[in-house]
């Protein structure tokens, strides 16, 4: 079998909302993946599991099941959304993200994603990690997801 390539493209959108009373930030982050099937047979994308970390704490998880079939020598772009919550011991971030004296409120998040593919009864898992800046002070949308060179740090080795 030839390789199945998973390429994390970047953040497609980040929608923010707040609960001032609870000093909590809600970030809905939509990411884009490119999955390439280099084989001469179809491959099933069984599931995608994703999580987002802030300061080594997991702030959001998501799982997509029975996603798609990728034909021979084909590529599919898949968007997935991870709802995240920055609260409790990280509630100090509410003050930063809603700080009235600045307009840009960048935070660094680690995006982790694992893609499970299957073909001929065989399963394979491919994982990626990427650090990304997100502005926790406003909604951000991209016409196209950020291309790889926009990622702020290299994935962990």
């Amino acid at each position: 079998p030839r390789s199945i390539e998973v390429k994390y493209i970047g953040v497609k959108s980040a929608y923010v909302s707040y609960d001032a009373e609870k000093r909590t930030i809600y970030l809905n982050i939509t990411n884009t993946l490119n999955i390439t099937n280099n084989n001469y047979y179809s491959v099933e994308v069984e599931n995608i599991t994703a999580q987002v970390q802030f300061s080594k704490t997991v702030i959001g998880k998501a799982r997509l099941n029975n996603i798609t079939n990728i034909g021979p020598l084909d590529m599919k772009q898949i968007d997935y959304t991870v709802p995240t919550v920055i609260a409790e011991e990280m509630s100090y971030m509410y003050d930063f993200c809603t700080l009235l004296s600045i307009k840009v409120h960048n935070i660094v998040l680690m995006m982790q994603v694992t893609v499970t593919t299957a073909y001929f009864g065989h399963s394979e898992q491919i994982s990626q990690e990427r650090y990304q800046y997100v502005d926790c002070g406003r909604n951000t949308t991209y016409q196209l997801a950020q291309s790889e060179y926009l990622n702020v740090l290299q994935p962990q080795q």
């Epitope: 953040v11 980040a14 923010v16 707040y18 001032a20 993200c97 809603t98 009235l100 004296s101 600045i102 307009k103 840009v104 409120h105 960048n106 990304q132 800046y133 997100v134 502005d135 002070g137 406003r138 909604n139 951000t140 949308t141 991209y142 016409q143 950020q146 926009l150 702020v152």
Partner: antibody, heavy 118, light 113 residues
Framework: EVQLQQSGPVLVKPGASVKMSCKAS????????IHWVKQSHGRSLEWIGV????????NYNQKFKGKATLTVDKSSSTAYMELNSLTSEDSAVYYC???????????WGQGTTLTVSS | DIVMTQSPSSLSVSAGEKVTMSCKSS????????????LAWHQQRPGQPPKLLIY???TRESGVPDRFTGSGSGTEFTLTISSVQAEDLAVYYC?????????FGAGTKLELK
């Protein structure tokens, strides 16, 4: 429907003070910042400052510090701007504008016309 | 403070024409973290308050016709109207939304020939 209803036109004498209002409706007042913007006759727009109705925090354009004071009354969902020591230079239309925290201006009030003349 | 410079100051066009107006900022409006440009365009029709058209340099506000397109990055931005309609006659302002104090350009006035 979101509305920012501003107080009516005002004519005042030089040296006086004025307090204009911006009554918000159709949304949760404390969830959005209120900005104030000045538009002098036939001229561009100048940002005066912003207030958070939730905690009364403010941020002023240095140019308007000492000239403008921003306040809110949560009970009536109303934002106020007081301008003091008025001169003819303060004659303008003043707008209140809403933003969801640091997002872009999404709703503008209809404006309050201030005329300073003796 | 970031200075916003718009050109031309006025444009005289016929209905159906394509128009382009420019906005330049004295400092970059790019958030180098998320690679988003924090620039907005507002439309002000005669006797009305301004209205948000474009934010993030290129994202149309909901309800804004797709004949309005924003582009550019860093310090140079453009607003294009693909086919001008009578209701587009207005003054267009670009706005720095990257850092306080928020600043506006002097405006481009769109008039009918």
């Amino acid at each position: 429907e979101v509305q920012l209803q501003q107080s009516g036109p005002v004519l005042v004498k030089p040296g006086a003070s004025v307090k204009m209002s911006c009554k918000a409706s159709g949304y949760t007042f404390t969830d959005y910042y209120i900005h104030w913007v000045k538009q002098s006759h036939g001229r561009s727009l100048e940002w005066i400052g912003v207030i958070s109705p939730y905690n009364d925090n403010t941020n002023y354009n240095q140019k308007f510090k000492g000239k403008a004071t921003l306040t809110v009354d949560k009970s009536s969902s109303t934002a106020y701007m007081e301008l003091n020591s008025l001169t003819s230079e303060d004659s303008a239309v003043y707008y209140c504008v809403r933003t969801y925290y640091s997002n872009y201006f999404d709703y503008w009030g209809q404006g309050t016309t201030l005329t300073v003349s003796s | 403070d970031i200075v916003m410079t718009q050109s031309p100051s006025s444009l005289s066009v016929s209905a159906g024409e394509k128009v382009t107006m420019s906005c330049k900022s004295s400092q970059s409006l790019l958030n180098s973290g998320n690679q988003k440009n924090y620039l907005a365009w507002h439309q002000q029709r005669p006797g009305q308050p301004p209205k948000l058209l474009i934010y993030g340099a290129s994202t149309r506000e909901s309800g804004v016709p797709d004949r309005f397109t924003g582009s550019g990055s860093g310090t140079e931005f453009t607003l294009t109207i693909s086919s001008v309609q009578a209701e587009d006659l207005a003054v267009y302002y670009c706005q720095n939304d990257h850092s306080y104090p928020l600043t506006f350009g002097a405006g481009t006035k769109l008039e009918l020939k």
